[in-house]
C-alpha cells in the first residue's frame, strides 16, 4: 500500500519569501506528511535574491488507497507530495537536460505542504462488513518556505500546532520543547 | 492553540431535555469528524456517536440511538449534543472529541483533541 | 460489538518498577489505541495503533499486541505515570473503551 500509483507529474511553485504570516486555522494538522527520521538538515543555497520568481518548488502527484486494517477505499485519492528541493527555477531540475543543482551554501529553502483539503472516503471491509467513513487530509499544494537558522532551532516560530501530534518510533521528545517547535522541526525536514 | 472547548455544568431534572457546546478553536470542524463520549463517575468511557460537520451526516452508539442528537454549525465552528428524556443514568460528563488524521506509508486514525467535558447531573 | 476487557482493573507499582497492563478484545481487532486520564481532567492519546506513542509520551511507554491480545507498558514506573488508562478499538462498529486500568504509585 503507498506508493502504487506514482504519477510524477511537476508543477512549480513560486514562493513568498518575506516573513510568513500564520497558517490559516483549519490547517494546523499534519503539515509535513512524512517523518523528519533522517535526522539530516536540509541543503543551503546560495542565493540571496529578492526576486521571488528566482525560486520554484516541485508539486508531484501521487495516487494511493487509504486504509483501516483490512479495509480499502473504494477509489484511490489523489494527493501532492512536495518534493523536498527548493531553488531557482532556472537551476531547478524539473525537465530533462535543465540546468544542474547548486553547491550547498546560504539560507534553507523547503518544498513544504501549504493548502489542505479534507475528503471524505468510504472504506470497503472483508467479510461482509459495513463500509466504513473516515475523513483523510491531504496535501492541495505546496510551497518554497525560507527557513532561518532561527527557524531551525524552531524554538520560537510558531508554524501551526496540533494538541496531540503522535511521534512514531521511541524516541522521546523532550519535556522542555514545545509541540509548535516539534512542528518546526518536521517542516525544516520535509 | 487547538482546542475544544465546551459549555458549562447542566443541572436539569428527570425527563427534561439538555443541549451540550463544543466549540473548536485553531481548526475548521468541516475537515473533522467530531465524536461524543460520555464517562459517569468513577467509570470507563462510552462513545455516543459522531458527525460529519460539513454535511451532518451522523452514526450513533446502538444504545444512544433516541437518546442523543448530534448537531454541527459550521458557521460558529461548534458542535453540540442533545440528550433528551433525561435519568440519573445520564448523570455524567461528556466529552467532545476530533477524529484524528496521520498519513506516513499508512493511514490513522485517533482521537488527538478532546474538549474540557461538561458535567450533566440530573435530578430533581 | 466488541468488548474490551482490561486487567487488572486497578494496579499500583513503585517507582522504577515495570509495569505491564493488557486488554483483551472478544474478537479480532486490527489496532487498539490507548488513552491516558488523570482526576479530573480529559483523557489525553497515550499510544495510537497498537505501538506508537503521542507526543510527549516518554519512551518509558510502549504498546504492542495484535488479534485480541494488546498491552502496555511502562519499563520504568515513575509518579507521573499514575492515570487510568484505557484501551479503544474501532476495528468493528460501533467504537468502544475498555473500562480502564487504574494504575497508583506505591
Known amino acids: 500500500q503507498g506508493w502504487q500509483a506514482f504519477k510524477n507529474d511537476a508543477t512549480e511553485i513560486i514562493p513568498e519569501l518575506g516573513e510568513y504570516p500564520e497558517p490559516p486555522p483549519e490547517l494546523e494538522n499534519n503539515k509535513t506528511m512524512n517523518r523528519a527520521e533522517n535526522g539530516g538538515r536540509p541543503p543551503h543555497h546560495p542565493f540571496e535574491t529578492k526576486d521571488v520568481s528566482e525560486y520554484s518548488c516541485r508539486e508531484l502527484h501521487f495516487t494511493r488507497y487509504v486504509t483501516d486494517g483490512p479495509c480499502r477505499s473504494a477509489k484511490p485519492v489523489t494527493e501532492l507530495v512536495c518534493s523536498g528541493q527548493c531553488g531557482p527555477a532556472r537551476l531547478l531540475p524539473n525537465a530533462i537536460g535543465r540546468g544542474k543543482w547548486w553547491r550547498p551554501s546560504g539560507p534553507d529553502f523547503r518544498c513544504i505542504p501549504d493548502r489542505y483539503r479534507a475528503q471524505r472516503v468510504q472504506l470497503l471491509c472483508p467479510g461482509g462488513e459495513a463500509p466504513r467513513a473516515r475523513k483523510v487530509r491531504l496535501v492541495a499544494s505546496c510551497k518554497c518556505k525560507r527557513l532561518t537558522r532561527f527557524h531551525n532551532q524552531s524554538e520560537l516560530k510558531d508554524f501551526g500546532t496540533e494538541a496531540a501530534r503522535p511521534q512514531k518510533g521511541r524516541k522521546p521528545r523532550p519535556r522542555a520543547r514545545s509541540a509548535k517547535a516539534n512542528q518546526a522541526e518536521l517542516e525544516n525536514a520535509y | 492553540e487547538v482546542q475544544l472547548q465546551q459549555s458549562g455544568a447542566e443541572h436539569v431534572k428527570p425527563g427534561a431535555s439538555v443541549k451540550l457546546s463544543c466549540t473548536a478553536s485553531?481548526?475548521?470542524?468541516?475537515?473533522?469528524?467530531i465524536h461524543w463520549v460520555k464517562q459517569r463517575t468513577a467509570q470507563g468511557l462510552e462513545w455516543i456517536g459522531r458527525?460529519?460537520?460539513?454535511?451532518?451526516?451522523?452514526e450513533y452508539a446502538p444504545r444512544f440511538q433516541g437518546k442523543a442528537t448530534i448537531i454541527a454549525d459550521t458557521s460558529s465552528n461548534t458542535a453540540y449534543l442533545q440528550l433528551s428524556s433525561l435519568t440519573s443514568e445520564d448523570t455524567a460528563v461528556y466529552y467532545c472529541?476530533?477524529?484524528?488524521?496521520?498519513?506516513?506509508?499508512?493511514?490513522?486514525?485517533?482521537?488527538?483533541?478532546w474538549g474540557t467535558g461538561t458535567t450533566v447531573t440530573v435530578s430533581s | 460489538e466488541i468488548v474490551l476487557t482490561q486487567s487488572p482493573a486497578l494496579m499500583s507499582a513503585s517507582p522504577g518498577e515495570k509495569v505491564t497492563m493488557t486488554c483483551s478484545a472478544s474478537s479480532s481487532v486490527s489496532y487498539m489505541h490507548w488513552f491516558q486520564q488523570k482526576p479530573g481532567t480529559s483523557p489525553k492519546l497515550w499510544i495510537y495503533s497498537t505501538s506508537n506513542l503521542a507526543s510527549g509520551v516518554p519512551a518509558r511507554f510502549s504498546g504492542s499486541g495484535s488479534g485480541t491480545s494488546y498491552s502496555l507498558t511502562i519499563s520504568s514506573m515513575e509518579a507521573e505515570d499514575a492515570a487510568t488508562y484505557y484501551c479503544?478499538?474501532?476495528?468493528?462498529?460501533?467504537?468502544?473503551f475498555g473500562a480502564g486500568t487504574k494504575l497508583e504509585l506505591k
Open positions: 458527525i460529519d460537520p460539513e454535511d451532518g451526516e451522523t
Open positions: 479503544q478499538q474501532w476495528s468493528s462498529n460501533p467504537l468502544t
Open positions: 485553531d481548526f475548521n470542524i468541516k475537515d473533522y469528524y
Open positions: 472529541a476530533r477524529e484524528g488524521y496521520y498519513y506516513d506509508s499508512r493511514d490513522y486514525w485517533y482521537f488527538d483533541v
